[in-house]
């Protein structure tokens, strides 16, 4: 996160760290807990690393440096990448992770509510992006979970800023015209959440941007509301019943 500040314990209890253990262990992506056994993240996090057993998912943590060999983590039972995601495109950058064992909810580890299907009418004015990613383009992974308040921008405005790309209605953009605040490398897959009527909702999944926090280059996020049918289909067909946090 560029231009962010430290988060507090329990402030973003749905935020998880997706880490890979090969020879060493490192944080690669963020994710959002959406049910006892489900994490929503970005499909591109798994490019070149589709093997389930190399991944470790840490939930209920604030500081990555607190992780030791004794810190509990979740393992992956199944990775479900959107069927239309292609490595050669930036579309449908969304994936579900089914955990091997369900997680208990605590003050520091609980799910984020999902938006209503095709939610286009809600005007979100209080949106935040969180993650342990770089604090500048040529930076490094941060120890303490960072947060930053970023306004949404219209898809029309976003398309103007990214003429070489196709900004679809299944994407949502956020950023300041002057730059300075944005997600960055290592924040991929993490949440863009907005508070509406006193409730936090998962509006976007951190997907891509041209550099980080550059002027007139907003961050681009996968629009969760556009994938609600897919999320419900995959979680229900796997579970037999839905266990998602839907909005009240």
């Amino acid at each position: 996160i560029v231009g962010g500040t430290n988060s507090s314990w329990g402030e973003w209890p749905w935020q998880v760290s997706l880490q890979v253990k090969l020879t060493a262990q490192r944080h690669l992506c963020g994710g959002s807990l959406i049910g006892h056994q489900w994490v929503l993240t970005a499909a591109h996090c798994f490019d070149g690393l589709p093997l389930q057993d190399v991944w470790r998912i840490y939930s209920g943590i604030l500081n990555l440096s607190d992780i030791t060999k004794d810190t509990p983590f979740s393992q992956i039972k199944e990775i479900i990448i959107h069927q239309n995601y292609k490595v050669s495109e930036g579309n449908h950058d969304i994936a579900l992770i089914k955990l091997q064992a369900p997680l208990n909810y605590t003050e520091f580890q609980k799910p984020i509510c999902l938006p209503s299907k095709g939610d286009t009418s809600t005007i979100y004015t209080n949106c935040w992006v969180t993650g342990w990613g770089f604090s500048k383009e040529k930076g490094e992974i941060q120890n303490i979970l960072q947060k930053v308040n970023i306004p949404l921008v219209t898809n029309e405005e976003c398309q103007k800023r990214y003429q070489d790309y196709k900004i679809t209605q299944r994407m949502v953009c956020a950023g300041y015209k002057e730059g300075g605040k944005d997600a960055c490398k290592g924040d991929s897959g993490g949440p863009l959440v907005c508070k509406h009527n006193g409730m936090w909702r998962l509006v976007g999944i951190t997907s891509w941007g041209e550099g980080c926090a550059r002027r007139e280059q907003p961050g681009v996020y996968t629009k969760v509301a556009e994938y609600m049918d897919w999320i419900l289909e995959k979680t229900q067909s796997s579970d037999g019943k839905a266990q998602m946090q839907s909005p009240a």
Partner: antibody, heavy 125, light 108 residues
Amino acid sequence: EVQLLESGGGLVQPGGSLRLSCAASGFTFSHYLMTWVRQAPGKGLEWVSYISPSGGHTIYADSVKGRFTISRDNSKNTLYLQMNSLRAEDTAVYYCARVARGIAARQRTSYYDYWGQGTLVTVSS
Amino acid sequence: DIQMTQSPGTLSLSPGERATLSCRTSQFVNSNYLAWYQQTPGQAPRLLIYGASSRATGIPDRFSGTGYGTDFTLTISRLEPEDYGTYYCQQSSRTPWTFGQGTRVEIK
């Protein structure tokens, strides 16, 4: 299966014009940035021009700026290169290529993942 | 413009040998925008490596790419007969997009 098929090459006199076409199939053409690359006989590869998915944004190499025009018709899945005021140094095999733009670590990637077989343009009197 | 300088110009090696091809750029290039292509006579170029180190679909694991910033390397661990040809590095970080002049890998 992704396919790119160029046509329109041939022999033309200096100062003449030619229009190359590239017919695309096997993918959603309107989602991809497309490019032209050329290769003079016995020489290396030279990027010529690219066009955004919508066709609204184009960029050219200095060597062809003001003489060549790239365009596309997404309804016909076809890319074009209109070449005017041709010179002997424009003699080359012209390739069209699809520009893949995936995502890696929150940044976009860019590379030419599929190429046509090329069409030869010879500028000579 | 970003200049791409490949070395050596020609590499004469026997099958089974290791080939190391270098590509230097005149300015910093984001690794995501660095690719390698192979071209054999009479054929269109073929994508080998993108993002400086990711193998394209169907490319055997004897091909590997490394590098960061201004220095990039393509390695062929054990040359096979079909690997002979010309190899180009290319950047699309900044326009004009540019290619290296190529390294020809020939049979010794």
